[in-house]
């Protein structure tokens, strides 16, 4: 692989933690980080075919790390695809041009040195600007193991046109029972997108006690269909030696 | 290689409907490209209208959007534009594009005048 | 919508090099291309998908984008390049295409 720049191309500022190079000394070694995780973060893009897709991973180590992409897990080869790929190490990114439906899919990029590596996943899928069916991002919401009394949030990234209705449901038992006479799981609505109803793509739960543990689907829907995906949560509760001590003896103020 | 040129009437009236088509040669419109419709004012700067895909799938200038028409005539290998409502303020040199995420090439553009 | 902020104008002495500035949100997460545009002509496309030149336009010409700015860069600047110069960008959230307002490249002497 050919060696990018350890400069990020896309920071005026100089957020480098390695030392600086002497003329005597080694520069200390540090393993790859990205340089703009802020620049990362929108993994699902949703592409009209013939258009133009740049995905970037903004990186830095020493020393330099190299870049590499894979397709749906595997090594991606510029004959993978007509018309090819560009990769511009300088800038950490990797261009695809008059995208078709087959480009559809996980892109990988994946930097290293010889004291680490890391990766980040971007998703791919290639659309009709015609109105299509809902489209959510893979692997969201996220399973969750979290302590009895915790917050927390479930996740889900949509891209539609038209607009959608954002549900989520909850699989719950009624009478023992998980379902119903029609053959349909039972689920309770604990939130939609309505006129007023704000963030609707994230679903918080405060406090949350061991019966709220269960399956929590995201479920979108447009006149042309829906789409939903799922993510388990699961409350514990805390080990006997993690519970606070109880203070037998007399608390003395000095 | 392709080729495109625009066909119209040069001169509208106020509240009229401005109609061009884009003949294309060399190539086929069923591409994988975007065919688009670029305007300029007299003196200012370029100005996307819209575009249409072969299927029929269109995106326009939300600016524009509600007075805009795309159509594509892939029998006659052609896509026009109607913009309807005109003003003064529309008048401008309208020119057709082939379109990826760049235009290239372009028509030579065509001189469209509001006017009564 | 997004914007792309060109300066209105840039003057160069021939032989010296040009620098056009397209600045915009995040532009580095884009493909910025460039057009060349001289008086009564149609655009020409120069740069495409930042950097890259189509056949036939000379090596003088690149381009580079990262951080919130795209460049043109013109170097070994000759009278013929005297034109008005575009970015645009296809935004990828809007899904619409975006000019730029316009550089005028003035070529001194």
């Known amino acids: 692989d050919a060696l990018p720049s350890s400069e990020d191309d896309d920071d005026d500022d100089d957020s480098s933690s390695e030392e600086k190079e002497t003329d005597n000394t080694k520069p200390n070694p540090v393993a790859p980080y990205w340089t703009s995780p802020e620049k990362m973060e929108k993994k699902l893009h949703a592409v009209p075919a013939a258009k133009t897709v740049k995905f970037k991973c903004p990186s830095s180590g020493t020393p330099n790390p190299t870049l590499r992409w894979l397709k749906n897990g595997k090594e991606f080869k510029p004959d993978h695809r007509i018309g090819g790929y560009k990769v511009r190490y300088a800038t950490w990114s990797i261009i695809m041009d008059s995208v078709v439906p087959s480009d559809k899919g996980n892109y990988t990029c994946i930097v290293e040195n010889e004291y680490g590596s890391i990766n980040h996943t971007y998703q791919l899928d290639v659309v009709e600007r015609s109105p299509h069916r809902p489209i959510l991002q893979a692997g969201l919401p996220a399973n969750k193991t979290v302590a009895l009394g915790s917050n927390v949030e479930f996740m889900c990234k949509v891209y539609s046109d038209p607009q959608p209705h954002i549900q989520w449901l909850k699989h719950i038992e009624v009478n023992g029972s998980k379902i119903g006479p029609d053959n349909l799981p039972y689920v309770q609505i604990l939130k939609h997108s309505g006129i007023n109803s704000s963030d609707a793509e994230v679903l918080t739960l405060f406090n949350v006690t061991e019966a709220q543990s269960g399956e929590y689907v995201c479920k979108v829907s447009n006149y042309i269909g829906e789409a939903n995906q799922s993510a388990w949560l699961t409350v514990t509760r805390p080990a006997l030696e993690e519970r606070p001590a109880v203070m037998t003896s007399p608390l003395y103020l000095e | 290689q392709v080729q495109l040129q625009e066909s119209g009437p040069g001169l509208v009236k106020p509240s009229g409907t401005l109609s061009l088509t884009c003949a294309v040669s060399?190539?086929?419109?069923?591409?994988?490209?975007?065919w688009s419709w670029v305007r300029q004012p007299p003196g200012k700067g370029l100005e996307w209208i819209g575009e249409?895909?072969?299927?029929?799938?269109?995106s326009y200038n939300p600016s524009l959007k509600s007075r805009v028409t795309i159509s594509v005539d892939k029998s006659k290998n052609q896509f026009s534009l109607k913009l309807s409502s005109v003003t003064a303020a529309d008048t401008a040199v309208y020119y057709c594009?082939?379109?990826?995420?760049?235009?290239?090439?372009w028509g030579q553009g065509t001189l469209v005048t509001v006017s009564s | 919508s997004y914007v792309l902020t060109q300066p209105p104008s840039v003057s160069v002495a021939p032989g010296q090099t040009a620098r056009i500035t397209c600045g915009g949100n995040?532009?580095?997460?884009?493909?910025v291309h460039w057009y060349q545009q001289k008086p009564g002509q149609a655009p020409v496309l120069v740069v495409y998908?930042?950097?890259d030149r189509p056949s036939g336009i000379p090596e003088r010409f690149s381009g580079s984008n990262s951080g919130n700015t795209a460049t043109l860069t013109i170097s070994r600047v000759e009278a013929g390049d005297e034109a008005d110069y575009y970015c645009?960008?296809?935004?990828?959230?809007?899904?619409?295409?975006?000019f730029g307002g316009g550089t005028k490249l003035t070529v001194l002497g």
């Open positions: 594009a082939r379109g990826t995420d760049w235009y290239d090439p």
């Open positions: 060399g190539g086929s419109i069923s591409s994988n490209n975007w």
């Open positions: 249409i895909y072969h299927s029929g799938s269109t």
């Open positions: 995040n532009i580095g997460s884009e493909s």
């Open positions: 998908d930042d950097s």
């Open positions: 645009q960008v296809w935004d990828s959230t809007s899904d619409h295409r975006v």
